[in-house]
Interface confidence: low
Amino acid sequence: GWVWNQFFVPEEMNTTSHHIGQLRSDLDNGNNSFQYKLLGAGAGSTFIIDERTGDIYAIQKLDREERSLYILRAQVIDIATGRAVEPESEFVIKVSDINDNEPKFLDEPYEAIVPEMSPEGTLVIQVTASDADDPSSGNNARLLYSLLQGQPYFSVEPTTGVIRISSKMDRELQDEYWVIIQAKDMIGQPGALSGTTSVLIKLSDVNDNKPIFKESLYRLTVSESAPTGTSIGTIMAYDNDIGENAEMDYSIEEDDSQTFDIITNHETQEGIVILKKKVDFEHQNHYGIRAKVKNHHVPEQLMKYHTEASTTFIKIQVEDVDEP
């Protein structure tokens, strides 16, 4: 019968002939009376056999990622008679893996959005690298993820590639971060190959800033002839947040005379001071009122940022009009 062991050839061998093993018949007594032949895909081009001994050699560099096994056929013939000594037999040559492929991130570019001020541990995004090497061959395709850039704000789980927040971030200071993740095979051991990817992490706004008046004192004037409903001027607050988090409502905090009102222009986010009751220069020629400003939408959990509303003082001078 046929005698052989399992055949393996390492991929990417640089030698011009690599001995893989020997195929032989147990009837072969070593007197060179038998001839061995190799048939099938790769016979004669990738693999050759020593016709006398049955020794098999690989004569080309192989790439496991291109082809991981070869199925060949062997024959042994008695030279004197030309007859087959053994029935033709099929055998397999397996290409064994070496760590010649670096991990690759196939889904890049990565981009994620996470709310500012998110607590430590908040999941941002998961990045995944793939390695073309053999996952069943040692650690060639076992990956470990690490953070090359992004400390101290982000961390990555070494085995999953899950990126989490490790320090609170304030959008008003910096609104986006580039994080660079490295995937290393061989679980980081010597000879490891690595791949990197960049993740753009954008911070979405939360309402962590209250509106604050630009001025602590506004001076306005109103003619005593002005009818009720007249707009007599505008006041303005600024809010470092954006979008609906910067929408605000102005109101009167103090007006003993109950002469004025403030309405909010939601287009411009300005407060418009309105005359609620007609004024009379001869009766009172100036007024002092206090206005306050608050955000329109403040979720319960963000109320701590909005404890005391910003206020401003408005001095209103009444202009005299000649009366008949």
């Epitope: 670096e102 090359l148 850039q149 200071l173 910096q174 971060y177 580039w178 660079i180 690595s194 990197t196």
Partner: antibody, heavy 120, light 110 residues
């Protein structure tokens, strides 16, 4: 907008030291690395080292180790590069360049350059 | 002698496509992002391509970058006279623990 403004040209004698400054504005100074790159007349670009303005950590190119010192002043958003034991081959334009948040990123903004001439 | 090898010069006529190569090793181009800089005569360098193939805003899409193994290249299509400049590749080198630049390529628009 981001701006890096460097100090003016210098003429130094061999053996002396030179200190070049680079004032940053338009961004959070402590969040970005700053590198120094030089270019000798008619030559290519050569990286000298990098400093992180937040902690002051530095990494210097092997070639300049022992001769270059990079420092920063966070109160004025300024980084400094001092090169000692000057020789004629140190005649070059010295650029500060903002390196991305960490070393693996690009230099996205550059100073206008400072010409240092070393001549006896 | 630069760690990254670039051709010293390249040329083309307006409208043509030119490619500038940058060859390195496993410790630099093989394992890190490649960046390209353009330096117009008498000015500071300007970022042209970052992280292998990304263009900063304001850089025309005529400029493109690519990387394969330990080599990178910069392609400029529809060449214009204002592209006449020096071009440098740059990458972080893990062995040297520092940035390395190519020797630069002087592009002439004929």
């Amino acid at each position: 907008q981001v701006q890096l403004v460097q100090s003016g040209a210098e003429v130094k004698k061999p053996g002396a030291s030179v200190k070049v400054s680079c004032k940053a504005s338009g961004y959070t100074f402590t969040s970005y690395y700053m590198s120094w790159v030089r270019q000798a007349p008619g030559q290519g670009l050569e990286w000298m080292g990098i400093i992180h303005p937040s902690g002051g950590d530095t990494t210097y190119a092997q070639k300049f180790q022992g001769r270059v010192t990079m420092t920063r002043d966070t109160s004025t958003s300024t980084v400094y590069m001092e090169l000692s034991s000057l020789r004629s081959e140190d005649t070059a334009v010295y650029y500060c360049a903002r390196g991305g948040i960490k070393l693996w990123l690009h230099f996205d903004y550059w100073g206008q350059g400072t010409l240092v001439t070393v001549s006896s | 002698q630069s760690v990254l090898t670039q051709p010293p010069s390249a040329s083309g006529t307006p409208g043509q496509r030119v490619t500038i190569s940058c060859s390195g090793s496993r410790s630099n181009i093989g394992s890190n992002f490649v960046n390209w800089y353009q330096q117009l005569p008498g000015t500071a360098p300007k970022l042209l391509i970052y992280t292998n193939n990304q263009r900063p805003s304001g850089v025309p899409d005529r400029f493109s970058g690519s990387k394969s193994g330990t080599s990178a290249s910069l392609a400029i299509s529809g060449l214009q006279s204002e592209d006449e400049a020096d071009y440098y590749c740059a990458v972080w080198d893990d062995s040297l623990n520092g940035w390395v630049f190519g020797g630069g390529t002087k592009l002439t628009v004929l």
